[in-house]
């Protein structure tokens, strides 16, 4: 039995930040779980982890180079990514594992979310500014 995961197909990070919501076909309330976010088509790079259990505060881990926070819903984990760089544009996959209570469960691979990080464009100063007011 596998947990199903739904993600937005694409998100655009205009201000170098984005909220990626991972929605599960499973209620995480009072469960021990590990939710993670993986970068790349082969999911090779794990960039954020949220660990939760029934007795402790949510714990969030960010890989060096990523600034991550996490928020828990009954059937979702939202990863808040900040300070993203243009070269971090990629496809990101949500993964979930539930360890307790038994049985151990994990998810079917999701379709992923393309996060497109838009560079910050500062408005250039005009070459020929208008006449200054007295």
């Amino acid at each position: 039995n596998k947990i199903l995961v739904k993600q937005s197909p694409m998100l655009v990070a205009y201000d170098n930040a984005v909220n990626l919501s991972c929605k599960y076909s499973y209620n995480l309330f009072s469960r021990e779980f590990r939710a993670s976010l993986h970068k790349g088509l082969d999911s090779a790079v794990e960039v954020c982890v949220v660990y939760g259990n029934y007795s402790q505060q949510l714990q969030v881990y960010s890989k060096t180079g990523f600034n991550c926070d996490g928020k828990l819903g009954n059937e979702s984990v939202t990863f808040y990514l900040q300070n993203l760089y243009v070269n971090q544009t990629d496809i990101y996959f949500c993964k979930i594992e539930v360890m307790y209570p038994p049985p151990y469960l994990d998810n079917e691979k999701s379709n992923g979310t393309i996060i497109h990080v838009k560079g910050k464009h500062l408005c250039p100063s005009p070459l020929f500014p208008g006449p200054s007011k007295p």
Partner: nanobody, 124 residues
Framework: EVQLVESGGGEVQTGGSLRLSCAAS????????MGWFRQAPGKEREFVAA????????DYAESVKGRFTISRDNAKNTVYLQMNSLRAEDTAVYYC?????????????????WGQGTLVTVKP
């Protein structure tokens, strides 16, 4: 809950070798990392080396690179630290740590569980 038990510490001459082991038990996920930190008397606990479950990510403190090697046996849930060319400044209590992060984290705050520590003494 994760339990960690270290072994392998002891006294050795400068230039000698030791191998530390750390066995983890409890509920494990498909990826996590374990690391070694050390604490000399009167000093902060500092990062030594770490490795993740998939064994595709390892990291070392600059001071031990080329001398220490971290490895793990996933079947035994055990991580090892092979320490060669030991120096007097390597004398410390070595602690094994466990983190739910899936990479070889050097950040002490990322580690959720710690072993009791094993003393390594390097004699001149």
């Amino acid at each position: 809950e994760v339990q960690l038990v270290e072994s392998g510490g002891g006294e050795v001459q400068t230039g000698g070798s030791l191998r530390l082991s750390c066995a983890a038990s409890g509920r494990m996920f498909s990826n996590y990392a374990m690391g070694w930190f050390r604490q000399a008397p009167g000093k902060e606990r500092e990062f030594v080396a770490a490795i993740n479950y998939r064994r595709d990510d390892a990291d070392y403190a600059e001071s031990v690179k080329g001398r220490f090697t971290i490895s793990r046996d996933n079947a035994k849930n055990t991580v090892y630290l092979q320490m060669n060319s030991l120096r007097a400044e390597d004398t410390a209590v070595y602690y094994c740590g466990f983190t739910y992060a899936g990479w070889a984290s050097s950040r002490r705050d990322d580690y959720n569980y710690w072993g009791q520590g094993t003393l390594v003494t390097v004699k001149p």
